[in-house]
């Protein structure tokens, strides 16, 4: 006569976190008499998931009829699976006893969990850089299972080539996260440019997961200056502008200085917007001519996002 | 699906006798099969359980005189050093306790040790 | 050994009536559950009414009934019928494999 078997027949099973996972296990004989008991792991540490004679396993039901007269398949569903309870769970035929000894176990099922990853989270700098200056990205997902994963850098819908991943852990876990650095060359038009990093992975269908960051937050371009003197406006008076150009972020302030004294600070308000996203600002100074026997130097002096002043200056003639 | 017993008479004390039970409609491979008797005008009692091979247990005062055995469709029931309390129905019945009660039963075959 | 008390050792009914027959074992039966209940008519074999305490085997009426764990079980018929005048035993496991004991049964007779 043959000797009760344990069949486990799938060496493995995957399911996606949430769902409920079934391990199947038959019996092929209901001697001898004892119950079936289920564990994750092997060895002593090994943890206990549903014991047929006793005990409470809220989330873990038969599949069959437990108690049915000749049911000989022991299958048990596990609900609301999470990364946590992936492994390899053994079905085990125990024979009555005091206390209830190992008769014989299955070969074991691989439970592998597909977790989702988290959006990307995606951080920029912490201060402000320059037109052709590099700056570093950084994209941020976790917990996904399993641990291959895609992902990508992209500028402008521009895929970028100069960046490093790292996936942890390196070893067996029950979840992952990715972690990448990409470097971006900052130009003057990239006020309204993006940095997208998109994750690609099993559990999302072809439908990979975007974080982006806006360079807005990231590029400060610096103004270019220009001061002209307007036809006289009146007999003793000149009209000085000093044109203030191409800035990006708005936060400016100008003051004009005569011969290098205070003559008045301004901050910019009403400015105009160009395509790029830039800023334009003009601001004027109206010189009292009659006021200075010698010429008199005018100078326009800005100081953009905090940092230091540039100025440019313009040398007003007064006749004698 | 029934099972048939065979093999009970009159027996002489310390004498042996062999109980057959046939089994028709199933298979005895995947099941344990217990042995029951019964005393004239008592109750049930409890003989001992024939699994495979080593798998089979016997009431304390049964072990040593009485020895089971199975094919896939026939199970035995070997009884040596018969006495006069031995005297009873024997039953045969599918199954072996617990999740696996004694769902179907032979006629029974009396068994009577006298000299 | 585990030790089965039967009590009443015989009860008269009439039909109808419920009859509660109860089975104590001498320590927990192993599971808590390794309780049966069989129905013996005279000149026939007995015949399995209940197993796992409560669990009602195939083809068994549903006025028969079983609860209990551990020590304590009861058998209960809701309304006795004429075909249910027998005895009735109870079989109880300990925990070990060779620890298997029935009860001294309880006859239900006619009022």
């Known amino acids: 006569e043959e000797e009760l078997q344990v069949i486990q027949p799938d060496k493995s099973v995957s399911v996606a976190a949430g769902e409920s996972a079934i391990l199947h296990c038959t019996v092929t004989s209901l001697i001898p008499v004892g119950p079936i008991q289920w564990f994750r792991g092997a060895g002593p540490a090994r943890e206990l998931i549903y014991n047929q004679k006793e005990g409470h396993f809220p989330r873990v039901t038969t599949v069959s009829e437990s108690t049915k007269r000749e049911n000989m398949d022991f299958s048990i569903s596990i609900s609301n699976i999470t990364p946590a309870d992936a492994g390899t769970y053994y079905c085990v035929k125990f024979r009555k006893g005091s206390p209830d000894t190992e008769f014989k176990s299955g070969a074991g099922t691989e439970l592998s969990v597909r977790a989702k990853p988290s959006a990307p989270v995606v951080s920029g700098p912490a201060a402000r850089a320059t037109p052709q200056h590099t700056v570093s990205f950084t994209c941020e997902s976790h917990g996904f299972s399993p641990r291959d994963i895609t992902l990508k850098w992209f500028k402008n819908g521009n895929e970028l080539s100069d960046f490093q991943t790292n996936v942890d852990p390196v070893g067996e876990s029950v979840s992952y996260s990715i972690h990448s650095t990409a470097k971006v060359v900052l130009t003057r038009e990239d006020v309204h440019s993006q940095v997208i990093c998109e994750v690609a992975h099993v559990t999302l269908q072809g439908d990979p997961l975007r974080g982006t960051a806006n360079l807005s937050e990231t590029i400060r371009v610096p103004p270019t200056l220009e001061v002209t003197q307007q036809p006289v406006r009146a007999e003793n008076q000149v009209n000085v502008t000093c044109q203030v150009r191409k800035f990006y972020p708005q936060r400016l302030q100008l003051t004009w200085l005569e011969n290098g004294n205070v003559s008045r600070t301004e901050t910019a308000s009403t400015v105009t917007e160009n395509k790029d996203g830039t800023y334009n600002w003009m601001s004027w100074l109206l010189v009292n001519v009659s006021a200075h026997r010698d010429d008199v130097k005018l100078t326009c002096q800005v100081e953009h996002d905090g940092q230091p002043a540039v100025s440019k200056s313009h040398d007003l003639k007064v006749s004698a | 699906r029934q099972l048939v017993e065979s093999g009970g008479g009159l027996v002489q004390p310390g004498g042996s006798l062999r109980l057959s039970c046939a089994a028709s409609g199933f298979s005895l491979s995947s099941h344990g099969i217990s042995w029951v008797r019964q005393a004239p005008g008592k109750g049930l009692e409890w003989v001992g359980t024939?699994?495979?091979?080593?798998i089979t247990y016997y009431a304390s005062w049964a072990k040593g005189r009485f020895t089971g055995s199975k094919t896939s469709s026939t199970a035995y029931l070997q009884m040596t050093s018969l006495r006069a309390e031995d005297t009873a129905v024997y039953y045969c019945?599918?199954?072996?306790?617990?999740?696996?009660?004694?769902?179907?039963w032979g006629q029974g075959t009396l068994v009577t040790v006298s000299s | 050994d585990i030790e089965m008390t039967q009590s009443p050792s015989s009860v008269s009914a009439s039909v109808g009536d419920r009859v509660t027959l109860t089975c104590q074992a001498s320590q927990s039966v192993y599971g808590n559950n390794d309780l049966a209940w069989y129905q013996q008519k005279p000149g026939q074999a007995p015949k399995l009414l209940i197993y796992?305490?409560?669990t009602l085997a195939t083809g068994v009426p549903s006025r028969f009934s079983g609860s209990g764990s551990g020590t304590d079980f009861t058998l209960t018929i809701s309304s006795l019928q004429p075909e249910d005048f027998a005895t009735y035993y109870c079989?109880?496991?300990?925990?070990?494999?060779?620890?298997?004991?029935f009860g001294g049964g309880t006859k239900v007779e006619i009022k």
């Open positions: 019945a599918r199954g072996s306790a617990w999740n696996d009660p004694f769902d179907y």
């Open positions: 079989l109880g496991g300990g925990d070990d494999e060779a620890d298997n004991v």
């Open positions: 024939i699994g495979t091979g080593v």
């Open positions: 796992l305490a409560s």
